[in-house]
């Protein structure tokens, strides 16, 4: 080994070196939290970049760059260090116009703590292992969600556009002429029935067990879907999102009530099956796989 490499190895294995890097990262994180940093922090920023560059140079000189088994770039944790340094120089010395997006990558410096603290490294390792093991469960989950999204698409496509429409129009007005002019919230409130405090028109349906309109109103299929158009089963992607919402139980009772009012109470069977299979079974299966992965990592 050359004298330079021997010195690099000595520095790299020294505990003070690890302490220096850890303190630098933590100090850097403190500086990043500043709202309006003073001008002198610019020099501190250069110092941090210098220390990170020195750390990487020491590692490269001690281990080699990329040729060989234990070289710098063969360790995934060093990829993070490398990216941090590259972005530090890019944002400082290369004029890229609007660099605010690139400055966001400075946050990656905080992740360097993981590679420095050994316990944290183990936990993150276990997390990565659990994600690898989760792939099969994820495939099963996506498959199940897709199947139920397709069923939902067939059963409820367009149903959430059913609204209670006013039974009195001007002489020149027809349903289509109104459909073509509906734009503002005011227009909607003029022609549709709204429950007090509701931001969406009252839903209704054409089957006997679906929601009925109050006197003076008729059920029609007009306008957008509820919740600013985000709640629907009109396309596979929207249906998939609705099913994901059911699986995660994210305000699912509202979706359940909306759909049952528009399609009919019979369809509660669909929701019972989805909640039991998706929410109770699949979610717990995911948790079980994560628990198993952590257990294996600990052993």
């Amino acid at each position: 080994f050359s004298p330079l490499r021997r010195i690099s190895i000595k520095i790299l294995v020294h505990s003070l070196f690890s302490m220096l890097i850890m303190c630098t990262i933590l100090t850097n994180c403190i500086f990043m939290t500043m709202n309006n940093p003073p001008d002198w922090t610019k020099n501190v920023e250069y110092t941090f970049t210098g220390i990170y560059t020195f750390e990487s140079l020491v590692k490269i000189l001690a281990r080699g760059f990329c040729v060989g088994e234990f070289t710098f770039l063969r360790d995934p944790w060093n990829w993070l260090d490398f990216v941090v340094i590259v972005f530090a120089y890019l944002t400082e010395f290369v004029n890229l116009g609007n660099v605010s997006a690139l400055r966001t990558f400075r946050v990656l410096r905080a992740l360097k703590t993981i590679s420095v603290i050994p316990g944290l490294k183990t936990i993150v390792g276990a997390l990565i292992q659990s994600v690898k093991k989760l792939s099969d469960v994820m495939i099963l989950t996506v498959f199940c969600l897709s199947v139920f999204a397709l069923i939902g698409l067939q059963l409820f496509m367009g149903n959430l556009k059913h609204k209670c429409f006013r039974n009195s129009l001007e002489n020149n007005e027809t349903l289509e002429s109104i459909m073509n002019t509906l734009e503002s919230e005011e227009d909607f409130r003029k022609y549709f029935y709204y429950l007090e405090g509701s931001k969406d028109a009252l839903l209704c349906g054409f089957s006997t067990d679906s929601g009925q309109c109050p006197e003076g109103y008729t059920c029609v299929k007009i306008g957008r879907n509820p919740d600013y158009g985000y709640t629907s089963f009109d396309t596979f992607s929207w249906a998939f999102l609705a099913l994901f919402r059911l699986m995660t139980q994210d305000y699912w009772e509202n979706l359940y009530q909306q759909t049952l009012r528009a399609a009919g109470k019979t369809y509660m069977i669909f929701f019972v099956v989805v909640i039991f299979l998706g929410s109770f079974y699949l979610i717990n299966l995911i948790l079980a796989v994560v628990a198993m992965a952590y257990e294996e990592q600990n052993q």
Epitope: G158, H162, N167, S168, L169, T174, L175, F206, V220, I222
Partner: nanobody, 124 residues
Amino acid sequence: EVQLVESGGGVVQPGGSLRLSCAASSRQFIRDVFTGWYRRAPGKQRELVARIYNEGNTQYADSVKGRFTISRDNAKKTVYLQMNSLRPEDTALYYCLFSGTISTGREYRSGDYWGQGTLVTVSS
């Protein structure tokens, strides 16, 4: 294809009567907001004559009030327009309009569905 069947048109003398009927016989017609009669006289725009909402309330053009009566038979899915005291200015092509919801089998669709029209001629 959605079809409204109109009938009852013809030639009548001034002061005479006619009864037009519009049948939405197809099972595709689910629920209307209203079903009405419109007319287009030669060289003029199409205008509302009368319409009846699904709850039974009616609406008439000022020119026909007191002379024309619109009614419906829900069982037969038919709307009638009884025209009395006809005048030469009532001469026009009378169209039936179903403004409501139809079923395509796969989904529901709301909009305006027009008939082919039936000709009413009032002349001596």
